[in-house]
């Protein structure tokens, strides 16, 4: 728990950089993002493809999408898991971090340095060993979060299913209804490559619990479905006098020293006809 | 026929509690959410709360929240309301209600008879 | 929360009138769902995504509207048309309904 009050913003005096005073856990061990570049990365054979159970929502069923202030949140069902992991680790939500119309690079993990369009990471809490998210959001193995890398691209009907609501979600507080759809639909092409780590939470606590999974492809969003998640919404209430955007919502990479990130692909470099003369 | 029967409806001293149930029958239960709409005499719907059957997660209206509590007993095909510290205000007549998606969003397209609460010392 | 105001509250019309009922949200909705209740009874589904008459509800119902303003239009009154009318959204949590609209017999 914080020291004292829960403000905090990714800009200004409650920014990234002061979010250790009211919450340590920021300020400590085995802290999110990082960057993946090849020196960290090791090949390991026992991480095998994770199967994504439940994960085709009934469109009959409502989901509470929310303005939370810090990004946009889709609440997901209990029974949606993940199997394939030590536990049984069941869905509690998903939600997006990006940057901004005039730099829309907002990624929070980067790839050797590079930061992509902006990122979803699906939350997942462990239901074998504890009730719910909030309690499992501080115990050791508690969460498990998948991260998908998004780059603009082509138009993606399946992240509109999300994004066609923005409106109804523009300021803090403020919650509307979606349509159950295929959550596996969101994650990108080849699924059983991806980078594994230990970390935290990206966002205060802080909390160092979580085990990260984080898809080697990315999907694609178009420029429009970016511009739309980068202007449609305010982390200030409705009648706040100082409205400010909900842009650049990613934390910057943190220190990653003496420690390994574990592929479950082999870092082969694939031969183009031009690199063989 | 797809059906939905509220019971437990009656009257309530001031401050006390509810539990209403909410049968179905017709379908399959655990595909569609089951909501609670309440209606006080001569005035309009207003929305409680709803439960999906397949798990039991709950969402509510704010104005409910840690007053009402919605279970499901999935062997029976039952949902239930709870309501705490009754007012006058509660009496209203309670219905149970199922959404169904049409393509865009939701209408509910069948609804229990009701049950009527009366808070009254 | 979106309030819903329906105008008018009550009405008295005669057999074979157009009857209008609008529906204002106080923010933007994506679509607006229309019921119909007798009294004692149950609502029943009427209108649905602002347009779409449910399976059995007489053509003489329209529906209408985008944005803040519906409206619910009965082209020639009937008698089984007495009954309250409400609208609702479901476009931001909570789910809210319009107070209704009494449609009486002058």
């Known amino acids: 728990a914080p020291v004292n009050g829960s403000k905090w913003t990714y800009f200004g005096p409650d920014g990234e950089n002061s979010w250790s005073k009211k919450y340590p856990s920021c300020g400590g061990l085995l802290q999110s993002p990082i960057d993946l570049h090849s020196d960290i990365l090791q090949y390991d054979a026992s991480l095998t493809p994770l199967e994504f159970q439940g994960y085709n929502l009934s469109a009959n069923k409502q989901f509470l999408l929310t303005n939370n202030g810090h990004s946009v949140k889709l609440n997901l069902p209990s029974d949606m898991h993940i199997q394939g992991l030590q536990s049984r680790y069941s869905a509690t939500q998903l939600h997006l971090h990006w940057g901004n119309p005039n730099d829309p690079h907002g990624s929070e993990h980067t790839v050797s340095g590079q930061h992509f369009a902006a990122e979803l990471h699906i939350v997942h809490y462990n239901s074998d060993l504890y009730p719910d998210a909030s309690t499992a959001s501080n115990k050791s193995e508690g969460l498990a979060v998948l991260a998908v890398l998004i780059e603009m691209g082509s138009f993606n009907p399946s992240y509109d299913k999300i994004f066609s609501h923005l409106q109804h979600v523009k300021y803090k507080g403020q919650e509307a209804f979606v349509p159950g759809f295929n959550i596996e639909e969101l994650l990108p092409e080849r699924t059983a490559e991806y980078y594994r780590y230990r970390g935290s939470l990206t966002t205060p606590p802080c909390n160092p619990t979580v085990l990260w999974t984080v898809f080697r492809n990315p999907v694609q969003i178009s420029q429009e479905q970016l511009l739309a998640l980068e202007t449609a919404l305010y982390c200030t209430h409705m009648d706040d006098p100082s409205p400010r955007e909900m842009i650049n919502n990613f934390r910057q990479v943190q220190k990653f020293d003496e420690r390994l990130v574990y592929t479950s692909f082999s870092q082969v470099q694939v031969c183009t006809a031009a690199g063989l003369s | 026929e797809v059906q939905l029967v509220e019971s437990g409806g009656g009257l309530v001293q001031p401050g006390g509690s509810l539990r209403l149930s909410c049968a179905a029958s017709g379908y399959s239960y655990t595909d569609y959410n089951i909501y609670w709409v309440r209606q006080a005499p001569g005035k309009g719907l207003e929305w409680v709360g709803y439960?999906?059957?397949?798990?039991?997660?709950?969402t509510y209206n704010q104005k409910f929240k840690g007053r009402a509590t919605i279970s499901v007993d999935k062997s029976k095909n039952t949902a239930y309301l709870q309501m705490n510290s009754l007012r006058a205000e509660d009496t209203a007549v309670y219905y149970c209600?199922?959404?169904?998606?049409?393509?865009?969003?939701?209408?509910?397209?069948?609804w229990g008879q009701g049950t009527l609460v009366t808070v009254s010392s | 929360d979106i309030q819903m105001t329906q105008s008018p509250s009550s009405l008295s019309a005669s057999v074979g009138d157009r009857v209008t009922i609008t529906c204002r949200a106080s923010?933007?909705?994506?679509?607006m769902h229309w019921y119909q209740q007798k009294p004692g009874k149950a609502p029943k589904p009427w209108i649905y995504a602002t347009s779409s008459l449910v399976s059995g509800v007489p053509s003489r119902f329209s529906g209408s509207g985008s944005g803040t303003d519906f409206t619910l239009t009965i082209s020639s009154l009937q008698p089984e048309d007495f009954a309250t009318y409400y609208c609702?959204?479901?476009?931001?949590?909570?789910?809210?309904f319009g107070q209704g609209t009494k449609v009486e017999i002058k």
């Open positions: 923010s933007s909705v994506t679509y």
């Open positions: 609702q959204q479901w476009s931001s949590n909570p789910l809210t």
């Open positions: 439960i999906d059957p397949a798990n039991g997660d709950t």
């Open positions: 209600s199922r959404p169904i998606y049409y393509g865009a969003y939701w209408y509910f397209d069948v």
